[in-house]
């Protein structure tokens, strides 16, 4: 017998989607061999409709996909927009169609529900609203109107025009009698429950001349939308529950065992600790829709997610809900990158951010995740030359090393810089990555003076002391501006005396500014790098003043001024939230906006919060 297993029968209705999972023994050969879905012909052949090697038959174009999950030993065939023509016998299998590694599946697609024997069929999603219309004749216009539910053999009164409401429907049902012109009454039931499903009878009048109408109410649990994302990638759940719940608390929960659905995030401020630093709930639109972005997908994030609306901010009976089945593909296109970067107070970090290498021209961004309320991520810097005011002189986004990675350097670290940061671009929204910066005990490796004052027209020499651990690194000085840090000539002055227990390999490298002008005022960085990979940096602010006495200035560590206090956060923050995260085009439009730049998109990037890799701040 074949080791392949799957559903023997699949029954659905026209217009629906099916998701057929086939299980195979996850041997290394099986994991990487061709997977296929084929239709069995009358003469015994099996015609491929879709395969893991990219083939899609014209019959399935635009409505089917096949996804392999090698680590689980499964592959999934999704087929949308079913028609009765899709009914038939199929095989899901491995290798070549004619060989034995396959499983037979019978797919039966029937007509959708409609009117059956004068019974109106109402098919409504769980938690939503149904309106059951009940016509009557003129002679019953003044008589009692009622709705019954068939429970077993007996009709049970649900509501009537005299004011009775069955306790199971209290607070969520009403009976409306239309104006005199219309011979119709309607019963509106809100917050539909699964238990509301069944046969109903509406009646006008109570005698033999009464008008009766049958209704069949089908309450559907939402069909989970299948979502496939890469490990370390990002997923966005768009939740549209309708305007009737616009003012009700929203939630996203992840189903655990049994009927439990553990809140991941809600609009009442709750957030699961496992998602700290890697989740944003975007404020809802007027129509009540909202979205949740999760970055740094981990293997354990896979599962069934429900979003819904309820005053408690969690799943309750009668909550309107949407459902997703998230699969996390471990054969990820998103490379591993450090999830934790450590730096010391006064020191620096260099963060490597992956992006989709096919989108080298995309705009790169870096933002600081804030957990307040539902989470947000105000932008700090972009690759187009914008830097948030309070980060001037200590933050730079560099396109290097390129080819799928950019670098963000942050120096003059304080304890307030500890937290979660997101790397993202205005291109592929699946490539959002998160990195946590931790501030640890220790001294910065590079030693520079504090603030330095240069004199117009004179020469200024600024020292930077590199310990011996950086002997093999390239050492540089550069002048910071909001588009990067432009390299400047520097002089190696030989071994440094600034380090105890450090041999001849330590270095003193000086920056010399000849004939200082006003344009020389600003931030200067010294740093180390290896090729296009950056390590530690240290920053010095050079102020320029009028000449007081002749001569050149040579600054030592001791003479340096104290570093200025950190600037207060500017009010014109740009952040990833609201519609921006849902619409990458907002990025493109934003360039036309004045420099307050209040809004930006959370376009797609990713994070490996799932790995324990760490990167030190001092070197790569």
């Amino acid at each position: 017998k074949s080791p392949i297993f799957g559903p023997e029968e699949v029954n659905s209705v026209e217009g629906n989607s099916v998701s057929i999972t086939c299980y195979y023994p996850p041997t290394s050969v099986n994991r990487h061999t061709r997977k296929y879905w084929c239709r069995q012909g009358a003469r015994g052949g099996c015609i491929t409709l879709i395969s893991s090697e990219g083939y899609v038959s014209s019959k399935y174009a635009g409505r089917a996909n096949l996804t392999n999950f090698p680590e689980n030993g499964t592959f999934v065939v999704n087929i949308a927009q079913l028609s009765q023509d899709d009914s038939g016998r199929y095989k899901c299998g491995l290798g070549i169609n004619s060989r034995g590694l396959s499983f037979d599946v019978s797919l039966e697609v029937s007509q959708g529900p409609g009117l059956l024997n004068d019974t109106k069929v109402y098919t409504v999603d769980l938690g939503r609203t149904v309106t059951i219309n009940c016509p009557f004749k003129t002679e019953n216009a003044q008589k009692r109107k009622s709705l019954y539910k068939q429970i077993g053999l007996y009709p049970v009164l649900v509501i009537d025009s005299s004011g009775y409401v069955n306790p199971n429907y209290t607070g969520r049902i009403r009976l409306d009698i239309q104006g005199t012109g219309q011979l119709l009454f309607s019963v509106v039931i809100n917050q539909l429950r699964l238990s509301d499903a069944g046969q109903y009878l509406c009646q006008a009048g109570d005698d033999s001349n009464s008008n009766k109408k049958n209704a069949d109410l089908q309450v559907l649990k939402p069909e989970p939308e299948l979502v496939y994302e890469d490990l370390r990638g990002s997923v966005t759940f768009h939740c549209a529950l309708g305007p009737e719940v616009a003012n009700v608390a929203k939630f996203l929960c992840r189903q655990s065992s049994g009927e439990n659905c553990d809140v991941v995030v809600n609009t009442l401020g709750k957030r699961a600790p496992a998602f700290e630093g890697r989740i944003l709930l975007n404020p809802q639109d007027k129509d009540g829709s909202f979205s949740v972005v999760i970055t740094g997908l981990r293997k354990e994030d896979a599962g069934r997610y429900l979003c819904g609306a309820h005053s408690d901010g969690q799943l309750q009976e009668g909550s309107p809900i949407q459902a997703w089945q998230l699969f996390v593909n471990e054969e990820s296109t998103i490379p591993r990158s450090p999830t934790v970067v450590k730096g010391v107070a006064g020191g620096s970090v260099a963060v490597l951010c992956p992006y989709n290498r096919k989108e080298s021209k995309s705009i790169k961004y870096w933002c600081l995740w804030e957990g307040a309320q539902n989470g947000r991520c105000p932008l700090l810097v972009d690759s187009e030359g914008w830097v948030k005011a309070q980060y001037e002189g200590r933050l730079s986004l560099l396109e290097e090393p390129g080819n799928g990675t950019f670098t963000v350097i942050l120096n003059q670290l304080t304890s307030r810089d500890a937290g979660f940061y997101w790397c993202l671009t205005n291109g592929d929204t699946l490539w959002r990555t998160t990195v946590e910066i931790k501030i640890i005990e220790g001294e910065p490796n590079l030693k520079v003076p504090g603030n330095v004052t240069a004199v117009l027209g004179e020469t200024l020499k600024v020292p930077c002391h590199f310990p011996c651990k950086f002997s093999s690194y390239e050492k540089y000085w550069c002048k910071w501006n909001n588009t990067g840090c432009q390299a400047l000539p520097s002089q190696d002055e030989g071994p440094s005396k600034a380090f105890v227990n450090c041999d001849e390999n330590s270095r003193l490298v000086s920056l010399t500014l000849n004939l200082v002008t006003r344009a020389d005022e600003g931030w200067y960085w010294c740093g180390v790098k290896q090729g296009h990979f950056y390590g530690e940096t240290a920053a010095v602010y050079v102020a320029v003043e009028e000449r007081k006495a002749a001569g050149s200035r040579d600054v030592s560590l001791a003479k340096a001024d104290a570093a200025p206090d950190e600037k207060v956060l500017d009010s014109g923050f740009r952040e990833i939230e609201n519609k921006a995260i849902q619409d990458p085009r907002l990025f493109a439009e934003e360039k036309a906006v004045a420099d307050t730049r209040d809004q930006a998109d959370g376009s797609r990037a990713s994070v490996d919060s799932g790995s324990s890799e760490e990167q030190g701040g001092s070197s790569r």
């Epitope: 699949v10 049994g258 009927e259 069934r304």
Partner: nanobody, 126 residues
Framework: EVQLVESGGGLVQAGDSLRLSCAAS????????MGWFRQAPGKEREFVAT??????????YYADSVKGRFTISRDNAKNTVYLQMNSLKPEDTAVYYC?????????????????WGQGTLVTVSS
């Protein structure tokens, strides 16, 4: 909590038929699959059949040993699952357990199911 109550077991002759029912009550909001497992004396509990659903789509899974003889079905309105057993064999003798749960993964795996019934005994004599 979800409660499962099985019925329909009994003593039959080889070749006969039997229909098992499993009624679910309680909060079944996130139950997307119900199935049958069986345990013969001195043996491990084994998968028989499962029905999973998603909206108006049903997926039916069977163990090789019962294919073509057993049929699983459900009545959505009654929250009940049935196992129609035809052409019964003495080796089908076992306690049959109804199981329910989210069943996100392989329906043959016991821990995919969150709730279990008490079991109903099926004895097939030769």
């Amino acid at each position: 909590e979800v409660q499962l109550v099985e019925s329909g077991g009994g003593l039959v002759q080889a070749g006969d038929s039997l229909r098992l029912s499993c009624a679910a009550s309680g909060r079944t909001l996130t139950t997307y699959g119900m199935g049958w497992f069986r345990q013969a004396p001195g043996k491990e509990r084994e998968f028989v059949a499962t029905i999973k659903w998603s909206g108006s789509t049903n997926y039916k899974y069977y163990a090789d040993s019962v294919k073509g003889r057993f049929t699983i079905s459900r009545d959505n309105a009654k929250n009940t699952v049935y196992l129609q057993m035809n052409s019964l064999k003495p080796e089908d003798t076992a306690v049959y357990y109804c199981a329910a749960g989210t069943v996100l993964g392989d329906p043959r795996v016991l821990n995919e199911y969150d709730y279990w019934g008490q079991g109903t005994l099926v004895t097939v004599s030769s």
